[in-house]
Amino acid sequence: ITQQDLAPQQRAAPQQKRSSPSEGLCPPGHHISEDGRDCISCKYGQDYSTHWNDLLFCLRCTRCDSGEVELSPCTTTRNTVCQCEEGTFREEDSPEMCRKCRTGCPRGMVKVGDCTPWSDIECVHKESGTKHSGEVPAVEETVTSSPGTPASPCS
């Protein structure tokens, strides 16, 4: 996922909706003006804010990387939701990029979990049933994984 730099937006165009802050905060879909007197709406498809805030600018929408699919577009109150393409996954410990799922399990192991957008295939030892968490072995059995069905997005 490419998160663009957060940068102040240009001065609010006349067509942007304005309202008054509540307890010094502006509602989702808005940011506060420099003088703190107005709430200025975010620009649809360009930037957003998800909670009550005193942001001086809305946050720029994420653009999905190549290798990702857009599950839902950016709105004024929600950032873009991106997900790894079929056959690839993004681990929570390495959120920077989608990695290819393994095509099969090492010898002596069986597949118990499919490739999903957020996890590689899961392999366990045939005898003990313990999980395998090592590097992809040089020799793999011809146990193929089916693409995981998209469910919840990677974020």
Epitope: Q3, P8, I32, T50, T62, S94
Partner: nanobody
Framework: EVQLLESGGGKVQPGGSLRLSCAAS????????MSWFRQAPGKGLEFVSA????????YYADSVKGRFTISRDNSKNTLYLQMNSLRAEDTAVYYC??????????????????WGQGTLVTVSS
Amino acid sequence: EVQLLESGGGKVQPGGSLRLSCAASGRSISNYAMSWFRQAPGKGLEFVSASVWNNGGNYYADSVKGRFTISRDNSKNTLYLQMNSLRAEDTAVYYCVVARTPETPITSARGANYWGQGTLVTVSS
């Protein structure tokens, strides 16, 4: 590796105030979004507030709007949460969170983030 240490929790009467601190070590926090979450007894994690990495402003959950104020001191590598007009429903363990990579405010408990051990806040008469 980032270590986060929360402090400032304790027992307070309804209507009272507390100031939580989160001291970070292992990385400068100045370029990172940071957040507070809380977990009430028997409940799930709830987003409380977040600070944008470049001090462009802050996010607040509906439940704390107007009562809590998040701030940070980048020179001290510390995040704060000033909690006023405390209510019984604010009783929870409060956690400080920092993202592994520079990004927008963390408002979801999912994802690769660093978490502190938490500090308990009890609001009771």
